[in-house]
């Protein structure tokens, strides 16, 4: 079996001239592609795998939404020559329904990472933007994470930064077929330049009391006992197990299969940098 | 129907400079990686530059790089090709060329540029 | 020099078969790259006529044909007819060079 073979990065990889072409080993009997959208309120980007594949033929499309971070996976493993490159790559499917150029900042800045390479994802180097409130929601934290597509045996990863509608989440994600998107939340301007290692706190869990020492008592006890009306103690996690999905079509035409122009199909290059504010 | 029309070419002295655009109708230009081929009086053709649908990938022929600099304004459909320190050499006529299925498959009918004293 | 090697000349008769070969190295075809295939009439810009090694456009007959193994591709042209004569070039990207490069081109001349 012979398939196309590529690695997209945002847009550059799987562009039509670098196209590659490989003989799968013995065995193997299907070619894949996966393609991973991500979409922020300050524009969009993809990653794409094809190469050959493993499994049977067949498709599988998801949509996923990570506190208000789009995201649309395509995964499609077909089992004639050079079969795999059907899938549009350039994240259309995630454009913006309407116009949200009359939604006025909202006060937070943060940092923004579409489509860029990890470099130039550091610290406070990257592109800071202002927030906006879009589609009766409230965008009013930071996030700073990674989104990561596997297929063909090969691992794609790219960081993603910019605002979102959880002020302190810790170390969430959603995954879809080979993809994951992960990562933390934090409240305040530019709060975003490293949450790795970071954990937060929602002011809606209760704080950690500290219980006054036991009264000094005359009687010879092996006991001691101590109450407190206080509201009770948390258990505290550094970490928490990755939610399901809270929702499989977070917004109309986030499902459904990439559009496709009536021009030919333009295989290459991500549409990034599409400001969901223009 | 696909049309690609270049224009900005013209005479100039070596160490000067010009700016090729070319407009591009009939398809979603925003979504199409975008070149400049050249190809010199007599000669064959020479790939130049390259550029992702986006604008943040670029890529140049090693003979053009530092003095050239394409860029792209996806709201005009525009591409365009900035030639600065020009050489007797980058006398050509200067095509841009849309990648379709994995390849150029719309070409421009072509703007000359002659670089002497 | 082109990266890319074609032939500088090939010609044929009306009805002939005629190949053109294009050799690179293990950096552009060698290296898995798609190999393209243009045609370029006397005063008019290339056309795209075989891409993806040997898959043509809509509207290119199936005289034309490419093919490609190892670090080499290949352009048959069979029935060979008078609008045949033109330059025809190949082309692929390079990895070391960052970049796509063409063949130096092949002159067509049809005879008689």
């Known amino acids: 079996l012979e398939c196309y073979s590529c690695v997209q990065k945002a847009d550059d990889g799987c562009s039509p001239n670098k196209m590659k072409t490989v003989k799968c080993a013995p065995g193997v009997d299907v070619c894949t592609e996966a393609v991973g959208a991500v979409e922020t309120i300050h524009g969009q980007f993809s990653l794409a795998v094809r190469g050959c594949g493993s499994g049977l033929p067949g498709k599988n499309d998801r949509g996923l939404d990570l506190h208000g971070l789009l995201a649309f996976i395509q995964l499609q493993q077909c089992a004639q020559d050079r079969c795999n490159a059907k899938l549009n790559l350039t994240s259309r499917a995630l454009d913006p329904a309407g116009n949200e150029s009359a939604y006025p900042p909202n006060g937070v800045e943060c940092y923004s990472c579409v489509g860029l390479s990890r470099e130039a994802c550091q610290g406070t180097s990257p592109p800071v933007v202002s927030c906006y409130n879009a589609s009766d929601h409230v965008y009013k934290g930071c996030f700073d994470g990674n989104v990561t597509l596997t297929a063909a045996n090969v691992t794609v990863s790219l960081p993603v930064r910019g605002c979102v509608q959880d002020e302190f989440c810790t170390r969430d994600g959603v995954t879809g077929p080979g993809f994951t998107l992960s990562g933390s939340c934090c409240q305040g301007s530019r709060c975003n330049s490293d949450l790795r290692n970071k954990t937060y706190f929602s002011p809606r869990i209760p704080p950690l009391v500290r219980l006054p020492p036991p009264e000094p008592t005359t009687v010879a006890s092996t006991t001691s006992v101590t109450t407190s009306t206080s509201a009770p103690v948390r258990p505290t996690s550094t970490t928490k197990p990755m939610p399901a999905p809270t929702s499989q079509t977070p917004r109309q035409g986030v499902e459904h299969e990439a559009s496709r122009d009536e021009e030919p199909r333009l295989t290459g290059g991500a549409a990034g940098h599409q400001d969901r504010s223009n | 129907e696909v049309q690609l029309l270049e224009s900005g070419g013209g005479l100039v002295q070596p160490g000067g400079s010009l700016r090729l655009s070319c407009a591009a109708s009939g398809f979603t230009f925003s979504n199409a990686w975008m070149s400049w081929v050249r190809q010199a009086p007599g000669k064959g053709l020479e790939w130049v530059s390259y550029?992702?649908?986006?604008?943040?990938?670029?890529y140049y022929a090693d003979s053009v790089k530092g003095r050239f600099t394409i860029s792209r304004d996806n709201s005009k459909n525009t591409l365009y090709l900035q030639m600065n320190s020009l050489r007797a050499e980058d006398t050509a006529v200067y095509y841009c060329?849309?990648?379709?299925?994995?390849?150029?498959?719309?070409w421009g009918q072509g703007t000359l540029v002659t670089v002497t004293s | 020099q082109s990266v890319l090697t074609q032939p500088p000349s090939a010609s044929g008769t009306p009805g002939q078969r005629v190949t053109i070969s294009c050799t690179g190295s293990?950096?552009?075809?060698?290296?898995?790259?798609?190999v393209h295939w243009y045609q370029q009439l006397p005063g008019t810009a290339p056309k795209l006529l075989i891409y993806?090694?040997?898959k043509r456009p809509s509207g290119v007959p199936d005289r034309f044909s490419g093919s490609k193994s190892g670090t080499s591709a290949s352009l048959a042209i069979s029935g060979l007819r008078s609008e045949d004569e033109a330059d025809y070039y190949c082309a692929a990207w390079d990895d070391r060079l960052n970049g796509a490069v063409f063949g130096g081109g092949t002159k067509l001349t049809v005879l008689g």
């Open positions: 060329a849309r990648e379709g299925l994995w390849a150029f498959d719309y």
């Open positions: 293990s950096s552009n075809i060698g290296a898995g790259y798609v």
């Open positions: 993806d090694n040997n």
């Open positions: 550029i992702s649908s986006s604008g943040s990938t670029i």
